[in-house]
Amino acid sequence: IPPHVPKSVNSDVMASDNGGAVKLPQLCKFCDVRLSTCDNQKSCMSNCSITAICEKPHEVCVAVWRKNDKNITLETVCHDPKLTYHGFTLEDAASPKCVMKEKKRAGETFFMCACNMEECNDYIIFSEEYTTSSPD
């Protein structure tokens, strides 16, 4: 192996005839927590202007919608689907669309989605055709 070859491409190397291919990281909306006007809609845009390269190639895009007495927020991040987020398992992490699912949380309405397509957490779906409940 030539001395210039990068080492330690670890679990993101896929075995193949050419000696392995390297999985690239996902591109996700990444504005952390922002105030949102998304309410009583079947779907919303994130209105997040930052698309980040996820830190690790196995991370997926996540969106978290929260409503309480004071405000509505939308959180957009990258996250490892093997790890919980806000205490919840990332369901549908391989999905191409970010379809919101309600989670039980005291004192607020809490929806979360995960998906694995470029910038898929920019468009979040609450629609009845995808899920049994929608916010308010």
Epitope: I1, P2, V5, P6, V9, V13, M14, S16, N18, G19, G20, A21, V22, K23, L24, Q26, L27, I53
Partner: nanobody
């Protein structure tokens, strides 16, 4: 022969700047998304920045956002990385790599999809 050749690395003090270049040959440069990837001593690969082949839309890792700027000159088959406000943690070998069109994969780092790398050392 397909080739990616990086240049512009060196030793710089914290807070300083460097501009890396990656000259491509042997393939149609405008067909490929291009990445800057770095590897710090004893660490894995870190995907620093990406630029689209046409339209020049750019993406960054959060660790470099606001400090690094990726660009490309398709007429010169050259990719650039302008690095400002450099920190000790930016010390690494920097590689340019091309993405397999239509896939979220690149070929293995020993292939001609990767350059040979240029060393950037940030130290006082």
């Amino acid at each position: 022969e397909v080739q990616l050749l990086e240049s512009g690395g060196g030793l710089v003090q914290p807070g300083g700047s460097l501009r890396l270049s990656c000259t491509a040959s042997g393939f149609t440069f405008t067909e490929y998304r291009m990445w800057w990837v770095r590897q710090a001593p004893g660490k894995g690969l870190e995907w620093v920045s990406l630029i689209e082949p046409i339209g020049n839309r750019t993406y960054y890792a959060n660790s470099v956002r606001g400090r690094f700027t990726i660009s490309r000159d398709n007429s010169k088959n050259t990719l650039y990385l302008q690095m400002n406000s450099l920190r000790a943690e930016d010390t690494a070998v920097y590689y340019c790599a091309k993405q397999i069109p239509g896939h979220m994969w690149t070929a293995n780092p020993r292939s001609d999809y990767w350059g040979q790398g240029t060393q950037v050392t940030v130290s006082s």
